[in-house]
Interface confidence: medium
């Protein structure tokens, strides 16, 4: 197993319809043709595989599970969606990238993404 | 509806392993997140553990990590909990739940389960 170095922004805001998106980009070593990408979750004393995907380079990435999160890819780079959050959602987004093939497989974990979830604000009722 | 029934709780030393089972009926089974949650005498049930409906991604409390693993069998209809390196911190009643809905989830908070089993003992002597 070797080591990659991945990137993504420190914090990120979700949407108030709990939508919130971030970039992961990871210094490829080689020509990898197949990449495996998971964001885990850390907070309440929680680690969370929050989603996985694998992709062949250039194509779409499918994620497992009815996932919360989509994606596409560009070059080394990976543009994540995770959507319906809730403010109990809140807490550091860890990229983790994985070169599966051809070897020698490497291995990126990025240093996380705080989202921030605010639920928003029940409309008042309205007079009319 | 899903029935939840755990089992293999029981009495082991501290350091010792043990393996629960959690065996569940009905249609919805494999559809649904499932979840561990302990509960120690005098003290609030917690999250332990959880898993995806396939079995593809799992969530873990951070003093369970790197001792317990969770699996599933959606052939056989169970949920496993392994557990190494028990400590007497470990003690409690051990129960099985359903996530309320379908898709994975980032956070697992009590709130977030229903269909609770009736739970399995385990005793961590030291």
């Known amino acids: 197993c070797k080591a990659m170095h991945v990137a993504q922004p420190a914090v990120v805001l979700a949407s108030s319809r709990g939508i919130a998106s971030f970039v992961c980009e990871y210094a490829s070593p080689g020509k990898a043709t197949e990449v495996r990408v998971t964001v885990l979750r850390q907070a309440d004393s929680q680690v969370t595989e929050v989603c996985a995907a694998t992709y062949m380079m250039g194509n779409e990435l499918t994620f497992l599970d009815d996932s919360i999160c989509t994606g596409t890819s560009s070059g080394n780079q990976v543009n994540l969606t995770i959507q319906g959050l809730r403010a109990m959602d809140t807490g550091l987004y860890i990229c983790k990238v994985e070169l599966m093939y051809p070897p020698p497989y490497y291995l990126g974990i990025g240093n996380g993404t705080q989202i921030y979830v605010i639920d928003p604000e029940p409309c008042p009722d309205s007079d009319f | 509806e899903v029935q939840l029934v755990e089992s293999g709780g029981q009495l082991v030393q501290a350091g010792g392993s043990l393996r629960l089972s959690c065996a569940a009926t009905g249609r919805t089974y494999n559809s649904y997140p499932l979840g561990w949650f302990r509960q120690a005498p005098g003290k609030e049930r917690e999250f332990v553990a959880a898993?995806?409906?396939?079995?593809?991604?799992?969530a873990y409390a951070d003093s369970v990590k790197g001792r317990f693993t969770i699996s599933r069998d959606n052939a056989k209809n169970t949920v496993c909990l392994q557990m190494n390196n028990l400590k007497p911190e470990d003690t409690a009643v051990y129960y099985c739940a359903q996530h309320r809905s379908v898709g994975w989830r980032a956070s697992h908070h009590l709130s977030d389960y229903d269909n609770w089993g009736q739970g399995t003992q385990v005793t961590v002597s030291s």
């Open positions: 898993i995806s409906a396939s079995g593809t991604l799992r």
